[in-house]
Interface confidence: low
Amino acid sequence: MMTGTIETTGNISAEKGGSIILQCHLSSTTAQVTQVNWEQQDQLLAICNADLGWHISPSFKDRVAPGPGLGLTLQSLTVNDTGEYFCIYHTYPDGTYTGRIFLEVLESSVAEHGARFQIP
């Protein structure tokens, strides 16, 4: 039975040219996290494997940095970065947990961080 929950940074916004930290946190489970995938719609951004460490997709390696923790930092943001991002936790024995973050990249200086929220 999957008892865990994923808390994410929720709906967030940032300025064009800036950077943003995407974070998820898995709680309420004793399952072992074997790997975390970060995906943007259908594209793989990065993988953090418990044994092998981080792998950043070559097409993103100049704009993506690992961390903090199992999170991901996106740099040099463009309006095209607007969209859904997913943290996919592969765990044993529970299986897969997925968290969703929506990022809006704004042209002006009106960007504000959204509230954190939980995805059951």
Partner: nanobody, 111 residues
């Protein structure tokens, strides 16, 4: 118990240099990456630089060309060499490794 201890902060004049160290202890494994973040008064914590165990490095645009991150894997220690410091680099600098945080070290750039 995992501990991250930062050191090397202090007061420096604009254009000067500092080298920060972050010693990680208590790990049962070598962290796959270590990073530096900073938080200026009244501002959010921001990422500065990260280094993978294999040596690959990333930098925030604001420090690129001035700061250099490195790691000694055998000592589980990360370093941040900061050159050409500016007043806007003034902040508490934090080390992060495998989701553990240090207490921070204060860097003040002022004449």
């Amino acid at each position: 118990e995992v501990q991250l201890v930062e050191s090397g902060g202090g007061l420096v004049q604009p254009g000067g240099s500092l080298r920060l160290s972050c010693a990680a202890s208590g790990f049962t494994f070598s962290p796959s990456w270590m990073g530096w973040f900073r938080q200026a008064p009244g501002k959010e914590r921001e990422w500065v630089a990260s280094v993978l165990r294999g040596g690959y490095t990333w930098y925030a645009d604001s420090v690129k060309g001035r700061f250099t991150i490195s790691a000694d894997n055998s000592k589980n220690t990360a370093y941040l060499q900061m050159n050409s410091l500016k007043p806007e680099d003034t902040a508490v600098y934090y080390c992060d490794a495998a989701d553990y945080w240090g207490q921070g070290t204060l860097v003040t750039v002022s004449s």
